[in-house]
Interface confidence: medium
């Protein structure tokens, strides 16, 4: 058993049939010594008396809010949550496995630049009685500070018969050094509580590996005289790190016909313009990637050829 | 060329070679098989790699003030990785694929380090970890980790030389 926060305790249980469970001793937070009784949740049934209560926690029915009273007055509460371990593996029932970039990916994180700011998100099908708390640091043995906000519901989607809820959180490294080569990964820890079930999820990454620039901005076409060619130009996204002579991007320019089956023409360039042939009913798209480190490409910015 | 205590490197040449190093490091990486590094125990060889840290003056401001600190750090790293790529970890079994770019990568690391430090000038270089051959089983993981680490190192070096070529070239 360990304390998650004040008056909230997590009991770690091996979850198999006929498991003996964990013996837990609760102590009433009061100077009083006698006349103390204990109840669980809303029930008025007295579970025991005295300053301490010893219980055998085996299942969710044994978890919940234990309250000690004296003469009708509440003295203190202890909320017991369960953390299940089945076949040596901690349960992951609350969050959905996003399966990208590999199986057992529950948390996904992205950064728009090297400033030390990043966003993480996760998915669940649970809509009520759900709380999250997020902690983060750089490194684990001698952790350096990363400050995370509160997790918020950022999207709802319908997937077949189910509703899926996306939560996200923004974090900022306290003393970020954008130009340095990271040697210690960022660690993100999410505590999830659904009713009386506790689970924790972790992710470990370097900012450089989760970089995904915003799409290029101000995408424009300029027809070239007496030619089917056009000059496409664009600019670095506002959110990208500066100076651009140091934090450089590379770009992919694509000409795509109306039909998905049509052959795509692609050009790669380090410049912020390119000359391409504009076909009728086609569109021109540009995306960006860090020039020197192969992290994710941005989403496409597009304009129609006409 | 970067001479200790003084003159500027050939920024444009360094930029071109460091960008080539980035390309080679990324084309070499898939050849060692995909493994999740953080699920594996850390090996000494990759714990000791020289990183370009915050105080090394490799940020735009630091380069403007005095690029020598940063160039010395990059030089140290290039020599370190050049030694690792020439070590038994890469030259031993299991054999790399026939068209592996590791040989080219090794030669380019040497080329860039020589651009930064011509013959006859000696910057202190970091102690190379023991190059005694590990078992072939362990080599694959080490190759993977070293190349992942090298990708990060050469990305910072390439940024330094790109910025230098754009803003510090005579």
């Amino acid at each position: 058993i360990w304390e998650l926060k004040k008056d909230v305790y997590v009991v770690e249980l091996d979850w198999y049939p006929d498991a003996p469970g964990e013996m837990v001793v609760l102590t009433c937070d009061t100077p009083e010594e006698d006349g103390i009784t204990w109840t669980l949740d809303q029930s008025s049934e007295v579970l025991g008396s005295g300053k301490t209560l010893t219980i055998q926690v085996k299942e969710f029915g044994d978890a919940g809010q234990y309250t000690c009273h004296k003469g009708g007055e509440v003295l203190s509460h202890s909320l017991l949550l369960l953390h299940k371990k089945e076949d040596g593996i901690w349960s992951t029932d609350i969050l959905k496995d996003q399966k990208e970039p590999k199986n057992k990916t529950f948390l996904r994180c992205e950064a728009k630049n090297y400033s030390g700011r990043f966003t993480c998100w996760w998915l669940t099908t649970i809509s009520t009685d759900l709380t999250f708390s997020v902690k983060s640091s750089r490194g684990s043995s001698d952790p350096q500070g990363v400050t995370c906000g509160a997790a918020t519901l950022s999207a709802e989607r319908v997937r077949g018969d189910n509703k899926e809820y996306e939560y996200s959180v923004e974090c900022q490294e306290d003393s970020a050094c954008p130009a340095a080569e990271e040697s210690l990964p960022i660690e993100v820890m999410v505590d999830a509580v659904h009713k009386l079930k506790y689970e924790n999820y972790t992710s470990s990454f370097f900012i450089r590996d989760i970089i995904k620039p915003d799409p290029p901005k101000n995408l424009q076409l300029k027809p070239l005289k007496n030619s089917r060619q056009v000059e496409v130009s664009w600019e670095y996204p506002d959110t990208w790190s500066t100076p651009h002579s140091y934090f450089s991007l590379t770009f992919c320019v694509q000409v795509q016909g109306k039909s998905k089956r049509e052959k795509k023409d692609r050009v790669f360039t380090d410049k912020t313009s390119a000359t391409v042939i504009c076909r009728k009913n086609a569109s021109i798209s540009v995306r960006a990637q860090d020039r020197y480190y192969s992290s994710s490409w941005s989403e496409w910015a597009s304009v129609p050829c006409s | 060329r970067a001479v200790p205590g003084g003159s500027s490197p050939a920024w444009t040449q360094c930029q071109q070679l460091s960008q080539k190093l980035c390309t080679l490091a990324w084309s070499a990486h898939p050849l060692v098989g995909h493994m999740d590094l953080r699920e594996e125990g850390d090996e000494e060889t990759t714990n000791d790699v020289p990183h370009i840290q915050c105080g090394d003056g490799c940020d735009p401001q630091g380069l403007r003030d005095n690029s020598q600190f940063c160039l010395q750090r990059i030089h140290q790293g290039l020599i370190f990785y050049e030694k690792l790529l020439g070590s038994d970890i890469f030259t031993g079994e299991p054999s790399l694929l026939p068209d592996s770019p590791v040989g080219q990568l090794h030669a380019s690391l040497l080329g860039l380090s020589q651009l930064l430090q011509p013959e006859g000038h000696h910057w202190e270089t970091q102690q190379i970890p023991s190059l005694s051959p590990s078992q072939p089983w362990q080599r694959l993981l080490l190759r993977f980790k070293i190349l992942r680490s090298l990708q990060a190192f050469v990305a910072v070096a390439a940024r330094v030389f790109a910025h230098g070529a754009a803003t510090l070239s005579p």
């Epitope: - | 060692v32 995909h34 038994d88 054999s95 190059l131 051959p133 078992q135 072939p136 089983w137």
Partner: antibody, heavy 114, light 112 residues
Amino acid sequence: EVQLVQSGAEVKKPGASVKVSCKASGYSFTDHNMNWVRQAPGQRLEWMGVINPNYGTTTYNQKFKGRVTITVDTSASTAYMELSSLRSEDTAVYYCARRGFAYWGQGTLVTVSS
Amino acid sequence: DIVMTQTPLSLPVTPGEPASISCRSSKSLLYKDGKTYLNWYLQKPGQSPQLLIYLMSTRASGVPDRFSGSGSGTDFTLKISRVEAEDVGVYYCQQIAEYPFTFGSGTKLEIK
């Protein structure tokens, strides 16, 4: 074209030493380790050791420890295997083989006889 | 050391018929990258060994497709779908997963 060309046959007395050379061509000599393998008449192949031509670091089969020394001369793109304190059971064909074992020398017969 | 046990010692085959050679290692040669570090060689009379198969099942350059390798972490098989006269010689398996690299005792393939 990758080629490994070994020195000629040798006849040695028990207790003597022999040094076999292996000249490599057609590839960058320092990019690949060089293995040495031997085969006694009618016996299975036996790996003796390996050298990294960049640094001269070696790993030997414990069976030969103390008797075998593998060296290289990178300027001549040549690897050497020296076996000392020869005994009659060291009579064998000795091969050099490049890392990957796709390329082998033609073999050098060493006969140990009094 | 990893011990490589090869069977049979001798294999008489009729040309055009298939042939199969087995090799067993005393320790798994399957690494966590999913690759199995086992080689097969053919040594023709009076010649150096030639690499046939590496990584348990990958044919070396120039090796005819009648040769194939398969197996698990410790049990391996070299198959020749239709034996030809030029296939005679001694076949060896070898592990390169761990030092010292070790070879099987060899299987002599001869034409009936």
